[in-house]
Interface confidence: medium
């Protein structure tokens, strides 16, 4: 059976039930690679309080429709007078980014999730060439979600003191130059999430490969690398790479624009102070 949402296949995703201190790992096309959940678990529930793991969805027992994915298990559940099995149910809705699976609720037998994602859209209008997961949970299971920063067209200009070049970036996905035919971005190669413009030329200096990472409390890191083998002649033989560090501000203030903090041999380091790097509880308070 073909994978129903191939764009979501490359990653193991996370969802959280904060009320019960439970972290779910979800891999909709394969298995989650957590030994304690067994070799074929597609949805693995990690109870952080008791440090136990339970598979609540088996990749082999998958059934799919256009907007619903169900993973059954062989584990019977405790509903009186029935022979139900534990299962996970993921409802997909059209969204503007790859999005994040959200835990909705669970019964004794079924764990319910909802996922707003471009992968579920009938039309390709929001789909990216390349996009990676754009959220993380910290050790207290609080969500840090950069999805609102993703530009569906155009890009962010990085604050840089170099008058001869302009570095444009997008967050977690490539720059869509077709929907935003701004003169500077038009020359950016397809698939690039970091585009360096020099005069009338534009160069791919990084594409998203891995999802967002949490390096320290309230510091998130996104790394882009140039996939193409050909070296750029102004990089002194090095492969270009971009590292963006998103920082939660220490006090409430206006978000800043991304700033270039270091540049050497086409390795660009960017710092971006933004409240989106803060956990969701902070944003909602």
């Amino acid at each position: 059976q073909a994978a129903p949402f191939p764009e979501l296949c490359s990653y193991t995703w996370e969802a959280v039930d904060t009320k019960n201190n439970v972290l779910y790992k979800i891999n909709i096309c394969g298995s989650v690679d957590i030994v304690q959940c067994g070799p074929s678990s597609a949805v693995c529930m990690h109870d952080l309080k008791t440090r136990t793991y339970h598979s609540v969805g088996d990749s082999v027992l998958r059934s799919a429709t256009r907007s619903l994915l169900e993973f059954n298990t062989t584990v019977s559940c405790d509903q009186q007078g029935t022979n139900h099995r534990v299962q996970s149910s993921i409802a997909f809705l059209c969204g503007k980014t790859l999005g994040t699976p959200e835990f909705v609720t669970a019964t004794e037998c079924v764990h319910y999730f909802e996922w707003r994602t471009t992968a579920a859209c009938k039309k390709d209008i929001f789909k990216a060439n390349k996009e990676v997961p754009c959220y993380v949970f910290d050790e207290e299971l609080r969500k840090h979600d950069l999805n609102p920063l993703i530009k569906l067209s155009g890009a962010y200009l990085v604050d840089d003191s170099d008058p001869d070049t302009s570095l444009f970036i997008n967050v977690c996905r490539d720059i869509d130059t077709l929907r935003d035919p701004g003169s500077q971005l038009r020359a950016c190669p397809p698939g690039t999430a970091a585009c360096l413009v020099r005069g009338h030329q534009a160069f791919d200096v990084g594409q998203p490969r891995d999802g967002l990472k949490l390096v320290r409390k309230d510091r998130l890191v996104l790394s882009y690398v140039r996939e193409e083998a050909g070296k750029l002649d102004f990089c002194d033989g090095h492969s270009p790479a971009v590292t963006i560090t998103f920082v939660c501000p220490s006090e409430r203030r206006e978000g800043t624009i991304p700033k270039l903090t270091a540049k050497s041999n086409c390795r660009y380091e960017i710092e971006w102070i933004t409240e989106y790097a803060c956990h969701r509880d902070y944003l909602e308070s």
């Epitope: 039930d17 904060t18 009320k19 019960n20 201190n21 439970v22 109870d47 309080k49 008791t50 136990t52 339970h54 405790d78 609720t105 669970a106 019964t107 004794e108 764990h111």
Partner: nanobody, 115 residues
Framework: QVQLQESGGGLVQPGGSLRLSCAAS????????MDWYRQAPGKQREWVAT???????????SVKDRFTISRDNAKNTVNLYMNSLQPEDTAVVHHHYYC?????WGQGTQVTVSS
């Protein structure tokens, strides 16, 4: 002020059964997660069973198919039915309540399995 009070412990012969209860005040049981833990003499406290806020139940391998956790929202109690008890089940059993504002422990009730 959250208070948890366990009851139902005692001395039972191997193969016997007990029903432990935990009554709570100051909390809404139906809204949050409940756990039972136990501590055998000279051993570390170990997890026994969990009842999640929405009814999902999980058990430690050592008690699976013998113990059952349930909740009575009307009485604000959570129960642990213990069947086929063995001497190795001898322990002080504690109720544990978890919610966003913190976590709380009962003082425990003694379960002794001996012939």
């Amino acid at each position: 002020q959250v208070q948890l009070q366990e009851s139902g412990g005692g001395l039972v012969q191997p193969g016997g059964s007990l029903r432990l209860s935990c009554a709570a005040s100051g909390i809404i049981f139906s809204d949050n997660r409940m756990d039972w833990y136990r501590q055998a003499p000279g051993k570390q406290r170990e997890w026994v069973a969990t009842l999640a806020s929405y009814g999902w139940k999980t058990y430690a391998d050592s008690v699976k198919d013998r113990f059952t956790i349930s909740r009575d929202n009307a009485k604000n109690t959570v129960n642990l039915y213990m069947n086929s008890l063995q001497p190795e089940d001898t322990a002080v059993v504690h109720h544990h309540y978890y919610c966003n504002s913190g976590q709380y422990w009962g003082q425990g009730t003694q379960v002794t399995v001996s012939s």
